[in-house]
C-alpha cells in the first residue's frame, strides 16, 4: 500500500513539476526590467527564451520573436537546450511511469518489469529536474553578470551632457517557476526511485531440507517469502502557478484596461 502511495505521489509531483517546466519555458518573463533605483520609464521591458516584450503605460503590449538562431547568445541557446531536454525527458518519464504504476494492470506484467520501469522513470525525472534547475540557474547567472555590468555604466553619453537610459534586467517570474518546477520533478523522481525498491521482488525460495536428528525425524520446510518494504510519505502536493504563456511569434495587444501605473 505504502509503495503504491509513494509511487502515485511521485508520479503526481513529477507531473506538476513537468507542467511547471513547460510553463516556465514558454513564459515571457524570464528577465524583467529592473525598476529599483532606475529612472521611472513609462515602458516596461521583459524577455523570455523565445521573444522579448514591451508593455507601455497605455497598456499596449508588443512582443517580438527572436527570429535569428545564429545571432543569439550561446548561453541563451544552452538554456533553451537544457529546458527542452528537461521537457522531453520528463515527458518520456511520465509515459513510462504511467505503465509502471502499481495501480494500473497491463496484461501479466511482472512486478520486476514494473520496478525497472519505475526506476527508469524516476531517473528520467531526476535528470529532467536537474536540467530545468541548471537551465534556470545558468540564465539567472547570466542576468546577475549583465546586471552588474550595466550598473557599472548606468549612464553613457557624450561628456555627460546627453544621457542614455541603460535598461537593467532582473529575475522574472519564470525563473522562480522553473526552480520550483525543477525541484518538484526532482523530488518526484526520487520518490519513484524509492518506490522502485519496494516493488522489486526480493524472493529467496529455500528448497525443502530434511534434518535427520537422532531419534526424531523432523522435516523443516520454510516457505518462500517476499520482502516488501514500503516507505510511507506525507509529502504535501504543492501547487505551482503557471505563467500566461503565449506562443505566437509576434503579438500586439492594443491599449487596454491592463495598463500599469
Amino acid at each position: 500500500m505504502a509503495v503504491t502511495a509513494c509511487q502515485g505521489l511521485g508520479f503526481v509531483v513529477s507531473l506538476i513539476g513537468i507542467a511547471g517546466i513547460i510553463a516556465a519555458t514558454c513564459m515571457d518573463q524570464w528577465s524583467t526590467q529592473d525598476l529599483y533605483n532606475n529612472p521611472v520609464t513609462a515602458v516596461f521591458n521583459y524577455q523570455g527564451l523565445w521573444r522579448s516584450c514591451v508593455r507601455e503605460s497605455s497598456g499596449f503590449t508588443e512582443c517580438r520573436g527572436y527570429f535569428t538562431l545564429l545571432g543569439l547568445p550561446a548561453m541563451l541557446q544552452a538554456v533553451r537546450a537544457l529546458m527542452i531536454v528537461g521537457i522531453v525527458l520528463g515527458a518520456i518519464g511520465l509515459l513510462v511511469s504511467i505503465f509502471a504504476l502499481k495501480c494500473i494492470r497491463i496484461g501479466s506484467m511482472e512486478d520486476s518489469a514494473k520496478a525497472n520501469m519505475t526506476l527508469t522513470s524516476g531517473i528520467m525525472f531526476i535528470v529532467s529536474g536537474l536540467c530545468a534547475i541548471a537551465g534556470v540557474s545558468v540564465f539567472a547567472n547570466m542576468l546577475v553578470t549583465n546586471f552588474w555590468m550595466s550598473t557599472a555604466n548606468m549612464y553613457t553619453g557624450m561628456g555627460g551632457m546627453v544621457q542614455t537610459v541603460q535598461t537593467r534586467y532582473t529575475f522574472g517570474a519564470a525563473l522562480f517557476v522553473g526552480w520550483v518546477a525543477g525541484g518538484l520533478t526532482l523530488i518526484g523522481g526520487v520518490m519513484m526511485c524509492i518506490a522502485c525498491r519496494g516493488l522489486a521482488p526480493e524472493e529467496t525460495n529455500y528448497k525443502a531440507v530434511s534434518y535427520h536428528a537422532s531419534g526424531h525425524s523432523v522435516a523443516y520446510k520454510p516457505g518462500g517469502f517476499k520482502a516488501s518494504t514500503g516507505f510511507g510519505s506525507n509529502t504535501k502536493n504543492k501547487k505551482i502557478y503557471d505563467g500566461g504563456a503565449r506562443t505566437e511569434d509576434e503579438v500586439q495587444s492594443y491599449p487596454s484596461k491592463h495598463d500599469y501605473v
Epitope: 515602458v43 521591458n45 522579448s52 514591451v54 544621457q163 542614455t164 500599469y260
Partner: antibody, heavy 118, light 113 residues
C-alpha cells in the same frame, strides 16, 4: 467617435479649491488611462498626471503632488481633477486626454479655463 | 526631468515651402526593448486643444496628411512638413513619452506669410 466633454470655465478666489470634470463617451471608459495637462496662457504644456479608471491607479508629476487630486466615477464615465490652495500661478487651461500607442495623447477635451483672481 | 529643447521657437514661411523643426531631449528616448523612440509631435491651432500628429517619433496618426513626417532617434528628432499649407498655421510641440514625468518642448510657432 471618442469624445471628452469638459466642464465650463471657472473664476475662483486665491486659496480656494476647484473641481473640474471630463465626461468620456464613444469608448469603454475603463479601457484607457485619463491624463491631465496644464497650459498656462501663451505657454507650453505641462503633464499633471494620470488615473487608470480600471483599477484606480494614479501617477502624478511630482510638481503637482499635493496640488491636484485625480478621481474617477466609473458609473458616469467621468474623470475629475480637483485643484486646491489656488494661486495666480494656477490660472490656466486644463485638458483631459486619453492615452494611446506610444503613450501619446490621442483624444483631448476642449479644456477648462481656470482663472484665479481676487 | 527630461528637458525638451525645440528650435526654432518661431518660423515664418510661404505656402508650399518645406519646413523642418527640431526637438532635442536631454536624455535618449530610445527604448532598447523594442528599438522605438518614445517621442510624440502635436499640433495646436489657436483656441483649440493639441492634436496628435506623430507617435513613436515617426508613426503618423491616422487622418494626418502625409506631408507631415517625423524622424530621428535617441536625442535628436525632426518634424518635417514637405509642403506647408495655410491650415498648418499652428504651434508644434514635441513630448517625451518615455520617462516620467512626461515633458513637452517649448513649442515651435509656425506662421504663414
Amino acid at each position: 467617435e471618442v469624445q471628452l466633454q469638459q466642464s465650463g470655465p471657472v473664476l475662483v478666489k486665491p486659496g480656494a479649491s476647484v473641481k473640474m470634470s471630463c465626461k468620456a463617451s464613444g469608448y469603454t471608459f475603463t479601457d484607457y488611462q485619463m491624463n491631465w495637462v496644464k497650459q498656462s496662457h501663451g505657454k507650453s504644456l505641462e503633464w499633471i498626471g494620470f488615473i487608470n479608471p480600471y483599477n484606480g491607479g494614479i501617477r502624478y508629476n511630482q510638481k503637482f503632488k499635493g496640488k491636484a487630486t485625480l478621481t474617477v466615477d466609473k458609473s458616469s464615465s467621468t474623470a475629475y481633477m480637483e485643484l486646491n490652495s489656488l494661486t495666480s500661478e494656477d490660472s490656466a487651461v486644463y485638458y483631459c486626454a486619453t492615452i494611446y500607442f506610444g503613450n501619446s495623447f490621442a483624444n483631448w477635451g476642449q479644456g477648462t479655463l481656470v482663472t484665479v483672481s481676487a | 526631468d527630461i528637458v525638451m529643447t525645440q528650435s526654432p521657437s518661431s518660423l515664418t514661411v510661404t505656402a508650399g515651402e518645406k519646413v523642418t523643426m527640431s526637438c532635442k531631449p536631454s536624455q535618449s528616448l530610445l527604448n532598447s526593448g523594442n528599438q522605438k523612440n518614445y517621442l510624440t509631435w502635436y499640433q495646436q491651432k489657436p483656441g483649440q486643444p493639441p492634436r496628435l500628429l506623430i507617435y513613436w517619433a515617426s508613426t503618423r496618426e491616422s487622418g494626418v496628411p502625409d506631408r507631415f513626417t517625423g524622424s530621428g532617434s535617441g536625442t535628436d528628432f525632426t518634424l518635417t512638413i514637405s509642403s506647408v499649407q495655410a491650415e498648418d498655421l499652428a504651434v508644434y510641440y514635441c513630448q517625451n513619452d518615455y520617462i516620467y514625468p512626461y515633458t513637452f518642448g517649448g513649442g515651435t510657432n509656425l506662421e504663414i506669410k
